[in-house]
């Protein structure tokens, strides 16, 4: 299994939207992609989960564009706030 986030950093103005890309490789039929936000304290905050056989996930300002065949799960954060400045991680799990 493998997860790749090619964007090392992104800068966007407040109130705009940003899309963070995540590509993965897996031989599992059933799996989940999780998006987390890392606080300055290094604490990881769960944001949203995308199931491999679920509709495109959406939760508040967070939405996922799931391309199952291409194994791509992009996180979009809308109406950006200053507090959104952080490091974001995607993770693959069964």
């Amino acid at each position: 299994q493998k997860v790749t986030q090619a964007q090392s950093s992104v800068s966007m103005p407040v109130r705009k939207a940003v899309t963070l890309n995540c590509l993965y490789e897996t031989s599992w039929w059933s799996y989940y992609i999780f998006w987390y936000k890392q606080l300055p304290s290094k604490e990881m905050i769960f944001l949203i989960r995308q199931g491999s056989d679920e509709q495109n996930a959406k939760s508040g300002r967070y939405s996922v564009n799931f391309k199952k065949a291409a194994k791509s799960v992009a996180l979009t954060i809308s109406a950006l706030q200053l507090e959104d400045s952080a490091k974001y991680f995607c993770a693959l799990g069964e």
Epitope: D53, E54, Q55, N65, F66, K68, A69, A70
Partner: antibody
Framework: QVQLQQSGAELVRPGASVTLSCKAS????????MHWVKQTPVHGLEWIGA????????AYNQKFRGKAKLTADKSSSTVYMELRSLTSEDSAVYYC??????????WGQGTLVTVSA | QIVLSQSPAILSASPGEKVTMTCRAS?????IHWFQQKPGSSPKFWIY???NLASGVPARFTGSGSGTSYSLTISRVEAEDAATYYC?????????FGGGTKLEIK
């Protein structure tokens, strides 16, 4: 509104290749995968494969690996499917369909391919 | 690959009748989607996520099921419902479709 316009019917000789096109409009082309589906009276609907126009990443049904090759041109919002070494078994209607997660909400009108000597 | 088996292959009904067609999966799936196809036309997205009606689909259609057994029911069949209905899954690595149920109106 979302529209998928496919190329016209093709009559091709056995052993030859053919390239079908699917031009998308009404949405941001790189945001969605494009899939291809084959339909015949014998085998019904069969998923051939898909391409992510944003990255060019492709995925194929094992059955069609080596038979079909998918490409995308972002500048013209068009996806192409090349079918190689055609036989009578490849005679079918081929559809492009835009993905949305695990769904196929939008379909082209189909392209009839007839393989005959 | 997950195989989807639809039954019956052909269903004949009179206007106003209630009809049910089934879709059985060779392994458990999370969701089933349904398409309606009329001769000479491309498949139309009909029901998604097992039970959600696509835009413009009449309320007389309902979808249900879980695991390996799913169904599409039309409460009161109308002449315009004559078509072939296909189920589809994508819980496995590759999407697969059922063989279809052809609905004929007497």
């Amino acid at each position: 509104q979302v529209q998928l316009q496919q190329s016209g019917a093709e009559l091709v000789r056995p052993g030859a290749s053919v390239t079908l096109s699917c031009k998308a409009s009404g949405y941001r082309f790189p945001d969605y995968e494009m899939h291809w589906v084959k339909q015949t009276p014998v085998h019904g609907l069969e998923w051939i494969g898909a391409i992510d126009p944003e990255t060019g990443r492709t995925a194929y049904n094992q059955k069609f690996r080596g038979k079909a090759k998918l490409t995308a041109d972002k500048s013209s919002s068009t996806v192409y499917m090349e079918l190689r070494s055609l036989t009578s078994e490849d005679s079918a209607v081929y559809y492009c369909t835009r993905g949305y997660g695990i769904q196929f909400p939008y379909w082209g009108q189909g392209t009839l391919v007839t393989v005959s000597a | 690959q997950i195989v989807l088996s639809q039954s019956p292959a052909i269903l004949s009904a009179s206007p106003g009748e209630k009809v049910t067609m089934t879709c059985r999966a060779s392994s458990s799936v999370s969701y089933i989607h349904w398409f309606q196809q009329k001769p000479g036309s491309s498949p139309k997205f009909w029901i998604y996520g097992t039970s959600n009606l696509a835009s413009g689909v009449p309320a007389r259609f309902t979808g249900s099921g879980s695991g390996t057994s799913y169904s599409l029911t039309i409460s009161r069949v109308e002449a315009e419902d004559a078509a072939t209905y296909y189920c589809q899954q994508w819980s496995s690595d590759s999407p697969t479709f059922g063989g279809g149920t052809k609905l004929e109106i007497k």
